[in-house]
Interface confidence: low
């Protein structure tokens, strides 16, 4: 029988009455248009809801928007449109919410055609009050907060000016013209590209990369011949045009652009692209597109400097620049990533890595599922996960995979079981060990969310018909209860719960449709009475992450250490609570060859842990360009994986010598870089 339908599922007692007492309906006094929702701050309970409705008139479009505020996690809302003078808010800019718990909100208003500049409404008290500010420019992008100081804002104007405010949008200053792209770096640094000859598009590949560390008082040109740039972890990347042709190469800096090294990655042509899939302070996952319109490329993983790269995964599905990739960081377990590959027969298959891209493998077949018709062997097949690509292809997949750092080991995703992704209606699968094993959790597509750090999973069936039923599980998806939250079904549009999965409230959004009108409606359900007691020590059990062979002394070792977690027992129905902190006990492992990646000029043959010299480099001195100087590398082929904490065991030796020779690799060397002040 399906999960949740057999006798051994313990029912949560009297849950209907408990949930009925904690179900709060709010009907919004709005014609149905679009709705957007933002949480303001962490654990504040403050939600802002912006509804917009466009009335197309013969000559123009008339817009109306309303702003609502809740301070009890969505149970009650108050119309605060008057705080923004009943102004129509531009939804394409969204609600710019400040970092951390700053309580800051910026709304960008629609202004009439002839106005000198735009208009914003600013709040710094969690949207209790707003101040109207007229801008000296028309914004092209949403206001961007500095991660370090929420009073510092930057924005691009429709005329490509870079504007900065130092007092949370009260006063603005244009610090540079002809700007294409601007990003905050660390320490309130701004990086941006500029064009010289006409436009961003015309100068693509001839842009300059600039930096200001003092909000526009002084500038430094840190790169020329730039196509684009990106920030990831502690790395600054720039794709730079080659001198002689139309190819580009990636250059990397770890000192905010003062010095650059050429990344040991393939160059790309005009139609190709690079993409930073994931980055942290240790390393980066980089996708390099294949030539031609193949829809795939190669994933490379970097060393700790972002310079030397190891091939991680071939035929990685990534459709076009800014297109779709299924690359997913499984945040509930360290080192785990899931993505899709396009196999030779053009079918799409899911791959998973448990060691940060060192090795990739297929997902294990769920024990309670059969192989579908895509499987050559009906007894041997894999689980294949639907993610962004399936969603873009309009398959019946309402949600991407879900994992949360504080719901250790839990991964929820739509999938199919066979030799490749199937286009049949997917089911929902769950893993409770970070992707090593999987179980079918729900039949058919669902929306799902995690509450109380994994103590509750909530799901709603994806249907074109109106719905009035929500499903919930208190045992990580093994058994399910259903609750009818309203007598009159609604057309469901989305589930909303506070980011971070610590809340016990879930909001169900949708609209009601009558003969004359349709209105937005939300139902907020508080599960606090379902989990009626706080969890105690006896409710938790010790779990060793990445455990595959308990007999092995090195069992659970990933990136040089293993971690034991305290995890809630599936049978315990109790509250982790908002202050729940994941308890983990790390222990260091001995080094093995698995803890090293292959150094520059070396590669790992398939199914071998040893690094061997690349045939074309055998007998050559290994010299490469580093920080604008030529370096000589003495190595036996190994370099420690970034973030690997192993000690003892095997210890391959490497040494890098400065050859005191200059090499610029067509990029600005530090000596030539110019500075200027305003």
């Amino acid at each position: 029988s399906a999960p949740g339908e057999d006798e051994e599922c313990g029912r949560v007692r009297d849950f209907v009455a408990k949930l009925a007492n904690n179900t709060h309906q709010h009907v919004f006094d709005d014609l149905r248009g679009s709705v957007s929702l933002s949480w303001v701050g962490d654990s504040t309970g403050v939600i802002l809801v912006l509804t917009t409705f466009h009335v197309p008139l013969v000559i123009m479009t008339f817009g109306q928007s309303k702003l609502y505020r809740s301070e009890d996690y969505g149970k009650n809302f108050k119309d605060i449109t008057d705080l923004i003078n009943n102004t129509f808010i531009r939804t394409e800019f969204g609600m710019a919410i400040g970092p951390e718990n700053s309580g800051k909100v910026v709304l960008t208003a629609e202004v009439s055609g002839g106005s000198r500049g735009g208009r914003i409404f600013r709040s710094s008290d969690f949207a209790k009050n707003f101040v109207q500010t007229d801008l000296p420019f028309h914004p092209l992008t949403q206001m961007m907060y500095s991660p370090q100081n929420s009073d510092y804002l930057l924005a691009l104007s429709t005329e490509n000016g870079l504007w900065v405010s130092k007092n949370f949008g009260g006063k603005w200053e244009e610090i540079h013209k002809a700007v294409c792209l601007a990003k905050w770096g660390s320490d309130n640094t701004i990086f941006f590209t500029t064009y010289a000859n006409g436009s961003c598009k015309a100068d693509l590949g001839a842009l300059e990369l600039w930096r200001t560390s003092d909000l526009g008082k002084s500038f430094k040109t840190i790169g020329v011949k730039i196509y684009s740039f990106g920030l990831g972890g502690r790395f600054l990347f720039a794709s730079v045009m080659a001198d002689k042709d139309t190819t580009r190469r990636i250059h990397v800096s770890t000192d905010q652009g003062d010095t650059w090294s050429m990344a040991q990655l393939p160059s790309v042509g005009q139609e190709q692209f690079y993409s930073i899939l994931a980055a942290n302070d240790d390393m980066v996952f980089m996708h390099v597109d294949e030539p031609g319109d193949t829809g795939f490329g190669t994933i490379f993983t970097s060393d700790d400097r972002g310079i030397v790269y190891s091939k991680s995964l071939d035929r990685h599905l990534y459709t076009t620049t800014g297109g779709e990739t299924d690359f997913t960081n499984v945040t509930s377990l360290r080192g785990v990533y899931i993505t899709s590959v396009l196999s030779e027969d053009n079918s799409i298959q899911t791959m998973i890595t448990f060691d940060q891209g060192g090795r990739w493998t297929h997902l294990r077949k769920p024990e309670n599922s059969e192989c579908d018709a895509t499987a050559k062997n009906k007894n041997e097949c894999s689980l294949h996960i639907h993610a962004s690509y399936s969603i873009s292809q309009k398959l019946n997949v309402p949600m991407a995979p879900l994992s949360e750092p504080n719901a250790v080991g839990i991964v929820i995703a739509h999938g199919s079981v066979g030799d490749a992704i199937s286009v049949m209606v997917p089911d929902v699968y769950i893993s409770d060990d970070g992707g090593y094993s999987w179980t079918k959790m729900l039949e058919g597509p669902h929306y799902y969310t995690i509450l109380d750090s994994g103590g509750i999973i909530v799901a709603i069936e994806h249907s074109s018909r109106p719905i009035n039923v929500i499903k919930f599980s208190t045992d990580e998806g093994q058994c399910w209860q259903t609750y009818t939250f309203t007598r009159d079904p609604i057309y469901f549009t989305g589930l909303a719960s506070e980011p971070g999965a610590r809340s016990m409230n879930i909001s169900i959004w949708g609209f009601t449709e009558s003969f004359l009108t349709s209105q937005w409606v939300s139902y907020t359900i508080d599960f606090k009475d379902i989990l009626e007691r706080n969890c105690e020590e006896k409710d938790y059990t010790i779990w060793l992450a990445h455990s595959t062979d308990p007999e092995d002394y090195e069992d659970g070792c990933i990136l040089g250490y293993k971690e034991q977690f305290l995890r809630l027992r599936k049978s315990s129905v109790c509250q982790n609570g908002r202050d729940y902190v994941v308890t983990k006990q790390p222990s260091i492992c001995l080094c093995s060859l698995e803890d090293f990646l292959c150094d520059f000029g070396y590669y790992r043959p398939e199914n071998d842990s040893k690094c061997v010299e690349q045939p074309e480099l055998k007998g050559h001195d290994l010299e490469f360009c580093l920080y604008g100087r030529e370096e000589h590398l003495t190595t036996n082929g190994y370099r420690k994986i970034p973030g690997d904490k192993c000690q003892g065991g095997v210890n391959p030796v490497r040494e890098v010598k400065d050859l005191k020779k200059k090499c610029t690799s067509n990029f600005l060397s530090p000596e030539k870089q110019n500075s200027k002040s305003n």
């Epitope: 059969e370 018709a373 199919s416 030799d419 286009v423 069936e461």
Partner: antibody
Framework: EVQLVESGGGLVQPGGSLRLSCAAS????????MSWVRQAPGKGLEWVAT????????YYPDILKGRFTISRDNAKNSLYLQMNSLRAEDTAVYYC??????????WGQGTLVTVSS | DIQMTQSPSSLSASVGDRVTITCRVS??????LAWYQQKPGKSPKLLVY???NLADGVPSRFSGSGSGTDYTLTISSLQPEDFATYYC??????????FGQGTKLEIK
């Protein structure tokens, strides 16, 4: 051995109704999608309906929506097709097929439905 | 809806011949295509799934190939029992999962 046996076909007048059944054996019925496909005399194959393993999801071509209903009873290992407001152009052999994903891998022998006055 | 164009609609061949039937699809279906064989008075039989994979019990003289929008069923050496009608069917995206119009393979 996988077996699918259709029944319920026969002669029916235009505007009438008919319910076809398909008895399944030799496999775990409740984990497979199932489909109905028809073939008019001397013509090609035409997909009629599909139902998911648990019976939650049903699919029809636009031209048949509203007249035909596919259903299943997993306890009885049975698949059904309820056909209402039948027309002469619905005359065909109706096949039930196991439909696990990217193919219909096992088919029944078919049952003939004739719509005529 | 995705359109399927199967060609030829009929063909005559002799025992031992190599025969190719093609199926052209109106958009990329990412190898989500099946081939069936149907003999007169019998129900269809699955030959190939996912464009290239032979179903259980199907002789190795049958093979499927193709990707994107063009797919082919090949019989390397025609046997007397292979004279039948062949259909392709796609399984990409949302229904309808259309069949091709069929190719009737007759003895020359």
């Amino acid at each position: 051995e996988v077996q699918l046996v259709e029944s319920g076909g026969g002669l029916v007048q235009p505007g009438g109704s008919l319910r076809l059944s398909c008895a399944a054996s030799g496999f775990t019925f409740n984990i497979y999608g199932m489909s109905w496909v028809r073939q008019a005399p001397g013509k090609g194959l035409e997909w009629v309906a599909t139902i998911s393993s648990g019976g939650i999801y049903t699919y029809y071509p636009d031209i048949l929506k509203g007249r035909f209903t596919i259903s299943r009873d997993n306890a009885k290992n049975s698949l059904y097709l309820q056909m209402n407001s039948l027309r002469a152009e619905d005359t065909a052999v109706y096949y039930c097929a196991r439909h696990p994903g990217g193919a219909m891998d096992y088919w029944g022998q078919g049952t003939l439905v004739t719509v005529s006055s | 809806d995705i359109q399927m164009t199967q060609s030829p609609s009929s063909l005559s061949a002799s025992v031992g011949d190599r025969v190719t039937i093609t199926c052209r699809v109106s958009e990329n279906i990412y190898s989500n295509l099946a081939w069936y064989q149907q003999k007169p008075g019998k129900s269809p039989k699955l030959l190939v799934y996912a464009a290239t994979n032979l179903a259980d019990g199907v002789p190795s003289r049958f093979s499927g190939s193709g990707s994107g929008t063009d797919y082919t069923l090949t019989i390397s050496s025609l046997q007397p029992e292979d004279f039948a009608t062949y259909y392709c069917q796609h399984f990409w995206g949302t229904p309808p999962w259309t069949f091709g119009q069929g190719t009737k393979l007759e003895i020359k």
